[in-house]
């Protein structure tokens, strides 16, 4: 009885289509695969950024797989052929591993790359990224930002740079159609007549870096002798009400009374009849139902009541 063997895939490689970190892993079928024509051969693919402790593992019938990587580091991957037990009248047969690596040859020393890169998606509408020049780079150094997300044909360069002393230190992005809930890839590279500049790569999802506008139209309404309802409206813009969390800071007679986080545009406050002044501010943030992370908005304008009986008045700013 001949032992069944299968070859590893051929020409296993990592292909960089120029999408700033979104790479293709592809391979050719093993030789002599048509011996198993009635059988669906599968491939087990393992890959990771070099330095990561864990491999991502995929089992696929395809000859390619696509995923995002951190191009600041190298990538390693390995693959082997799997013949399911149905093909072999027994146990699963595996080929040996085929292995490959990929990395972008770094230019320049690490200190020359941009420092303190910070990107904020203002009100889920306007993306702005800013950075500081690398350490010790000369004024002739200029940085260029490129970006890509799935839906763009190719990486695009920033067309509206923020400048300081003639150097690009940030980018105002144009309207980014259908760009949230997917990986957004950025490369900031640089040029200098003096020395090579190290590129930096960044990946994030836009919904996770949203900084909303602050809430508006803060009001007080007396609900009962000892309760006041604080109300406000969602900020103007495209973010739906269901996506907000709010933080309220309430001061009674110059003493911080309450700091609370709520999901709705109201908060009911217990008060005493002796209250002479009541002020509150609110800020907003995208909640866990719409993102994995977010940035608190600025505080709203302060809304205050003072010097009159709260029971007799509804206050509207």
């Amino acid at each position: 009885d001949t032992e069944i063997k299968v070859n590893p895939p051929q020409d296993f490689e990592i292909v960089d289509p120029g999408y700033l970190g979104y790479l293709y892993l592809q391979w050719q079928p093993p030789l002599s695969l048509d011996h198993f024509k009635e059988c669906t051969v599968e491939y087990e693919l393992k890959y990771r950024n070099i330095g990561s402790e864990t491999w991502k593992t995929i089992i696929t019938k395809n000859l390619h797989y696509k995923d995002g990587f951190d191009l600041n580091k190298g990538i390693e991957a390995k693959i082997h052929t799997l013949l399911p037990w149905q093909c072999t009248n027994g146990s699963e047969v595996q080929s040996s591993w085929a292995e490959t690596t990929y990395w972008i040859s770094p230019q320049g020393i690490p200190e020359t790359k941009v420092q303190d890169m910070d990107c904020v998606y203002y009100n889920w509408q306007y993306l702005l990224c800013s950075w500081k020049p690398g350490i010790g780079v000369l004024l002739d150094t200029n940085y260029n930002l490129f970006y890509w997300y799935e839906g763009l044909d190719h990486a695009l360069q920033c067309v509206d740079y923020i400048k300081a002393d003639g150097q690009n230190i940030g980018c105002r992005f144009p309207y980014l159609e259908a760009s949230d809930y997917k990986d957004f890839y950025i490369c900031v590279n640089g040029s200098s007549e003096n020395k090579p500049i190290r590129s930096s790569y960044f990946t994030f999802q836009l919904q996770n870096i949203v900084k909303p506008l602050p809430p508006v139209y803060l009001t007080f309404t007396r609900e009962s002798s000892c309760e006041i309802k604080l109300k406000w409206s969602i900020p103007l813009g495209p973010i739906p009400a269901r996506c907000f969390d709010y933080e309220i800071e309430i001061r009674e007679d110059d003493t911080t009374l309450v700091t609370a986080t709520v999901e709705n545009e109201t908060y009911t406050l217990k008060t005493t009849n002796e209250t002479r002044q009541l002020c509150f501010v609110v800020r907003s943030k995208v909640n866990i139902y719409c993102s994995d992370d977010g940035i608190w908005s600025e505080w709203s304008d302060k809304q205050c009541w003072e010097g009159e009986d709260l029971s007799k008045k509804t206050l509207l700013r």
Epitope: D11, V15, L33, D34, T100
Partner: antibody, heavy 118, light 107 residues
Framework: QVQLVQSGAEVVKPGASVKLSCKAS????????MSWVRQAPGQGLEWVAT????????YYPESVKGRFTITRDNSTSTLYMEMRSLRSDDTAVYYC???????????WGQGTLVTVSS | DIVMTQSPLSLPTTLGQPASISCKAS??????VAWYQQRPGQSPRALIY???YRYSGVPDRFSGSGSGTDFTLTISRVEAEDVGVFYC?????????FGGGTKLEIK
């Protein structure tokens, strides 16, 4: 449909260099390996070079190794072969061909005649 | 290098009759053999891969068989458009090698 359109005929002197091109359409170029095969006048087919879909792997026979270089530009779906130190026995029609998933060649270009003559 | 030896060199055939071409490999190439047809003045055209599987669009009168070192291309009923040179090729190992060709002619 799959099409491979090659550059025009070349006449060069011995020792010179030339670069052939092959523009592909009708398929996802970066997913396929590509090959060059040549045919000297009145002779059979001789394999000259193969490159993998991403360009990471290249293969040559001893007869051209070090003189011929196969490259590809996936952004323009174009295959190239640069031939240096040409000799009279390199005179042939050069075909580009798509390598199918089993390393056979399923589609072929129309051929480019390269004549090496003093 | 693996040498692929084809026979016969020339194959005069009558229209409607069968024809067979043999290809022998100098070492085991499993089933990693392809067959091509080159009509006069044209580029080669792929017929068979993995020794016995027809490419899409290839008439079913063409069939391939064999494994290891002995391979055969058979045309069940020769038609006028079949004239040309037929080549076998192994892709079991680099360098890829072709047979010397078999010229099919109509008697």
């Amino acid at each position: 449909q799959v099409q491979l359109v090659q550059s025009g005929a070349e006449v060069v002197k011995p020792g010179a260099s030339v670069k052939l091109s092959c523009k592909a359409s009708g398929f996802t170029f970066s997913s396929y390996g590509m090959s060059w095969v040549r045919q000297a006048p009145g002779q059979g087919l001789e394999w000259v070079a193969t490159i993998s879909g991403g360009g990471s792997y290249t293969y040559y026979p001893e007869s051209v190794k070090g003189r011929f270089t196969i490259t590809r530009d996936n952004s323009t779906s174009t295959l190239y072969m640069e031939m240096r130190s040409l000799r009279s026995d390199d005179t042939a029609v050069y075909y580009c061909a798509r390598r199918d998933l089993r390393s056979a060649m399923d589609y072929w270009g129309q051929g480019t005649l390269v004549t090496v003559s003093s | 290098d693996i040498v692929m030896t084809q026979s016969p060199l020339s194959l005069p055939t009558t229209l409607g009759q069968p024809a067979s071409i043999s290809c022998k490999a100098s070492q085991n190439v499993d089933i990693n053999v392809a067959w091509y047809q080159q009509r006069p003045g044209q580029s080669p055209r792929a017929l068979i891969y993995s020794a016995s599987y027809r490419y899409s669009g290839v008439p079913d009168r063409f069939s391939g068989s064999g494994s290891g070192t002995d391979f055969t291309l058979t045309i069940s009923r020769v038609e006028a458009e079949d004239v040309g040179v037929f080549y076998c090729q192994q892709y079991n190992a680099y360098p890829l090698t072709f047979g010397g060709g078999t010229k099919l002619e109509i008697k």
